[in-house]
C-alpha cells in the first residue's frame, strides 16, 4: 500500500493549480472541484447526494484547508446542477456544475482551467496530473494541504478487462493507472489535467484505491461539452 499523499503522491506546489476547488459541506472538505468559468465549478454529482440539508460552499485559492492564506475565499453556491442522467448507483454521467453566488475574484491563485472540447481519447501512457485533498493512506488520513500525483492514462480495453472494471468503462469515461499511486476518497470531483487541459473529473463511485487491478475512473469532460455549455450559457 502507498505511503504518500493523495495515494503515493506528494504535496503540491502551493497555488500552482489556481483552478483547484474544495467543495465543502457544513464547513468541511467533501470533494474536489475545478473552476471552469468565473462563476462555475465542475465537480462530481455523487458528492452532493446526501447534502440536501447541509450548507454547500466552494473554497477557491487554497493550498491549506485550515491555515489563513491571502488568496483563499469561500463562496456560497447559488445553484447546483447535477447531470440529468446521473444516478446514485452508477458511475455514469457523474458530473455536477456549481454556480457560485458571485463571480470569483481572479488572480494568480484563482484562475479557470481550459477544458477539452474535442471528443477524442487521450493517448494511453500520457502522464496526467490529479490533485486533491482526499485521503492519503488506508487508515483514511485527511491531508491539510493540497496533494497531487502524476498518473499514466490506461487504455479502455485494459480497463474493461474482467479482472479490472469488467466492461463498466464506457466511451464517456477514461482510466488512469492505480498501482500504488492513485486518487482516492475525497478526491472525487477533482481534475485530471493532461497537457494543461482538463480532460477528466474524478468519479465518486466506491473503489479500492492503490490497487493496480482497479484503475482510477474519470469522467471525460469532452464527452459532455454540449451539456456543460448549455448550463454555463
Amino acid at each position: 500500500p502507498p505511503r504518500g499523499r493523495i495515494l503515493g503522491g506528494r504535496e503540491a506546489e502551493a497555488h500552482a493549480r489556481p483552478y483547484m476547488a474544495s467543495v465543502q459541506l457544513n464547513g468541511a472538505h467533501l470533494c474536489g472541484g475545478v473552476l471552469v468559468a468565473e462563476q462555475w465549478v465542475l465537480s462530481a454529482a455523487h458528492c452532493l447526494e446526501d447534502a440536501a440539508d447541509g450548507k454547500v460552499q466552494v473554497l477557491l485559492g487554497a493550498h491549506s484547508l485550515s491555515q489563513p492564506e491571502p488568496s483563499k475565499r469561500l463562496y456560497d453556491v447559488l445553484r447546483a446542477v447535477p447531470h440529468p442522467d446521473s444516478q446514485p448507483d452508477t458511475i455514469d454521467h457523474d458530473l455536477l456544475l456549481l454556480q457560485l453566488s458571485e463571480k470569483a475574484t481572479l488572480g494568480p491563485a484563482v484562475r479557470p482551467l481550459p477544458w477539452q472540447r474535442v471528443d477524442r481519447d487521450v493517448a494511453p501512457g500520457t502522464l496526467c496530473d490529479v490533485a486533491g485533498w482526499g485521503i492519503v493512506n488506508h487508515a483514511g488520513r485527511r491531508p491539510d494541504s493540497l496533494q497531487h500525483v502524476l498518473l499514466p492514462v490506461l487504455d479502455r480495453a485494459t480497463c474493461n478487462r474482467r479482472t479490472h472494471h469488467d466492461g463498466a468503462i464506457t466511451e464517456r469515461l477514461m482510466c488512469a493507472e492505480s498501482n500504488r499511486r492513485d486518487s482516492c476518497k475525497g478526491d472525487s470531483g477533482g481534475p485530471l489535467v493532461c497537457g494543461g487541459v482538463l480532460e477528466g473529473v474524478v468519479t465518486s463511485g466506491s473503489r479500492v484505491c492503490g490497487n493496480r487491478k482497479k484503475p482510477g475512473i474519470y469522467t471525460r469532460v469532452a464527452s459532455y461539452a454540449a451539456w456543460i455549455d448549455s448550463v454555463l450559457a
Epitope: 468541511a28 467533501l30 485521503i135 488506508h138 487508515a139
Partner: antibody, heavy 113, light 106 residues
C-alpha cells in the same frame, strides 16, 4: 476543531445486544474512514473494523465478524457499532477513531447478569 | 494475519535518556503507526506512515523502519512520556496492533 463524542457507558445482560454511537464534528465522515477499536480491562488495543461512510462499505477483523456490525448515518455525521450476543468476554472500552488520527473518549460496556 | 511483537513489554528510563521501542512483524509490512496511551485516556496517534510526526507531537519522538522491523525513538525521555506505546500495521488486512510496551520513568 475535530471532535468525536461517544455515547455513555452501558451495563448489559449476557446474550443481549448493544449499539454504541460516535458523533463527529469538524469534518465530514463521508470524506474519511471511521474505525472502532476494543480494549479489554488491563489489555491491549484490538482493531475491530472500519466503515467508509460514503458508501457503507465495511471491513472487519475476522475475529469480530458476526459479533460486530459497523454502520453510519451521514446526515447526522455519526458512526455506530452494534455488538451482538454479548458475553463477559465483550466487557471492554470501545473507541471510535477517525482515520486512527482522532479518537473518541471511549464507551465502557460491562456485560453482567 | 500479521502478528506484531513489541519489545520490551515493560521498560523504565531516566529523564533525558534515549529510548528505543521496537515492533517486529511476522511478515513484511509497508508502513507503521505508533500510539501513546496513558491510564484512563484514549490512545493518541504519535507517528503515521512509519516516520511522520502527527500534529502536536513533540519532536523528540521519531519513527523508522522497513520490512519486518520498526522502531519508535524518544530522543530524551521526559516524565510525561510515562505511558504504554502500541504499534499498528496498515499494510495487510486485518490491521493488527502490537501487544504494547509499557514505558515507565525511573
Amino acid at each position: 476543531e475535530v471532535q468525536l463524542q461517544q455515547s455513555g457507558a452501558d451495563l448489559v445482560k449476557p446474550g443481549a445486544s448493544v449499539k454504541l454511537s460516535c458523533t463527529a464534528s469538524g469534518f465530514n465522515i463521508k470524506a474519511t474512514y471511521m474505525h472502532w477499536v476494543r480494549q479489554r480491562p488491563e489489555k491491549g488495543l484490538e482493531w475491530i473494523g472500519r466503515i467508509d461512510p460514503a458508501n457503507g462499505h465495511t471491513i472487519y477483523d475476522p475475529q469480530f465478524q458476526g459479533k460486530a456490525t459497523i454502520t453510519s448515518d451521514t446526515s447526522s455525521n455519526t458512526a455506530y457499532l452494534q455488538l451482538n450476543s454479548l458475553t463477559s468476554e465483550d466487557t471492554a472500552v470501545y473507541y471510535c477513531a477517525e482515520a486512527m488520527d482522532y479518537w473518541g473518549q471511549g464507551t465502557s460496556v460491562t456485560v453482567s447478569s | 494475519q500479521i502478528v506484531l511483537t513489541q519489545s520490551p513489554a515493560i521498560m523504565s528510563a531516566s529523564p533525558g535518556e534515549k529510548v528505543t521501542l521496537t515492533c517486529s512483524a511476522t511478515s513484511s509490512v509497508s508502513y507503521m503507526y505508533w500510539y501513546q496511551q496513558k491510564p484512563g485516556s484514549s490512545p493518541r496517534l504519535l507517528i503515521y506512515d512509519t516516520s511522520n510526526l502527527a500534529s502536536g507531537v513533540p519532536v523528540r519522538f521519531s519513527g523508522s523502519g522497513s520490512g519486518t522491523s520498526y522502531s519508535l525513538t524518544i530522543s530524551r525521555m521526559e516524565a510525561e512520556d510515562d505511558a504504554t506505546y502500541y504499534c499498528q500495521q496498515w499494510s495487510n488486512y486485518p490491521f493488527t496492533f502490537g501487544g504494547g510496551t509499557k514505558l515507565e520513568i525511573k
